[in-house]
């Protein structure tokens, strides 16, 4: 029986050109984490394997950095980075747990709180 829960950073609204940290935390289970995959839509961004360490997909190498912890740092954000990101925890013996984070990347002119709903 899977008793664990995934807690995430929560959804994030960020500014174009900036950087953000995506993090998930698995709690309420004693299962062993064997691997964590980070994906966006159908693309694999990175893998953190308990034995082999980190692997960043070649197409993201210049903008994605491992950590902190099992999290992922996205740098030089573009509007195209807007979307849903998944942290997929492979555990033994529980199986797979998935967390979801939606990242919204705004043009810098509308990324300030006061301007968010003023510019059509």
């Amino acid at each position: 029986m899977m008793t664990g829960t995934i807690e995430t950073t929560g959804n994030i609204s960020a500014e174009k050109g900036g950087s953000i940290i995506l993090q998930c935390h698995l709690s309420s289970t004693t299962a062993q984490v064997t691997q964590v995959n980070w994906e966006q839509q159908d693309q694999l961004l990175a893998i953190c394997n308990a034995d082999l360490g980190w692997h960043i997909s070649p197409s993201f190498k210049d903008r994605v950095a491992p950590g902190p912890g099992l999290g992922l740092t996205l740098q030089s954000l573009t509007v195209n980075d807007t979307g849903e990101y998944f942290c997929i925890y492979h555990t033994y013996p529980d199986g797979t747990y998935t967390g979801r984070i939606f990242l919204e990347v705004l043009e810098s002119s509308v990324a300030e709180h006061g301007a968010r709903f003023q510019i059509p």
Epitope: T9, G10, I12, S13, E84, L106, V110, F117, P120
Partner: antibody, heavy 117, light 112 residues
Framework: EVQLQQSGPELVKPGASMKISCKAS????????MNWVKQSHGKNLEWIGL????????SYNQRFMGKATLTVDKSSNTAYMELLSLTSEDSAVYYC??????????WGQGTSVTVSS | DVVVTQTPLSLPVSFGDQVSISCRSS???????????LSWYLHKPGQSPQLLIY???NRFSGVPDRFSGSGSGTDFTLKISTIKPEDLGMYYC?????????FGGGTKLEIK
């Protein structure tokens, strides 16, 4: 002026599929996420999912996975929601709504869907 | 999923009253950057829902200042300082911090 114009009411048979449209005007269509919301029988609101027209990225409420499919046509500034294998439980008013910073600032007028044989 | 509980379900009022609507979530709505994506909507009969408040306390363009939002973490409040006829309808809160977004069950503001 920001406007979201939805397609008209639909009466469909159980088991059929249908597509609702939401034509956006008065703003940069690709710069905002478009959400879809269900309201059953004048009761609670339920978030179905969203699509970001710029790159076509989607996010769904798991409850509607396999029931709703979200797409956009950037050339006509139109968002679509296809509803599959309709049952009486899908009878509702469906809204499209633009969002930024995870709040829905402009809403379409709603599309009433009735599933009946 | 985050459960959002709104109280009361129904709120009988007289014009000129001041009222508060409460919205509580099953987990914190503040993300790791300190942003809280909690918004309030009014749904009048025969109309589409309209945004009143976003980000806990920011009034949307054109919303009268008799509407105000407050709160933090898991506990939020919408206050209407002087009820007018056009304020009657269903009020909903929405959390957009966690996937999937979830609405409160609604509060019906009606005349006594």
């Amino acid at each position: 002026e920001v406007q979201l114009q939805q397609s008209g009411p639909e009466l469909v048979k159980p088991g059929a599929s249908m597509k609702i449209s939401c034509k956006a005007s008065g703003y940069s269509f690709t710069g905002y996420t478009m959400n879809w919301v269900k309201q059953s029988h004048g009761k609670n609101l339920e978030w179905i999912g969203l699509i970001f027209p710029y790159n076509g990225g989607t996010s769904y409420n798991q409850r509607f996975m396999g029931k709703a499919t979200l797409t956009v046509d950037k050339s006509s500034n139109t968002a679509y929601m296809e509803l599959l294998s309709l049952t009486s439980e899908d009878s509702a008013v469906y809204y499209c709504a633009r969002s930024r910073s995870f709040a829905m600032d402009y809403w379409g007028q709603g599309t009433s869907v009735t599933v009946s044989s | 999923d985050v459960v959002v509980t709104q109280t009361p379900l129904s709120l009988p009022v007289s014009f000129g009253d001041q009222v508060s609507i409460s919205c509580r979530s099953s987990q914190s709505l503040t993300n790791s950057y300190g942003d809280t994506y909690l918004s309030w909507y009014l749904h009048k009969p025969g109309q589409s829902p309209q945004l009143l408040i976003y980000g806990i306390s920011n009034r949307f363009s054109g919303v009268p200042d008799r509407f105000s939002g407050s709160g933090s973490g898991t506990d939020f409040t919408l206050k209407i300082s002087t009820i007018k006829p056009e304020d009657l309808g269903m009020y909903y809160c929405l959390q957009g911090t966690h996937q999937p977004w979830t609405f409160g069950g609604g509060t019906k503001l009606e005349i006594k």
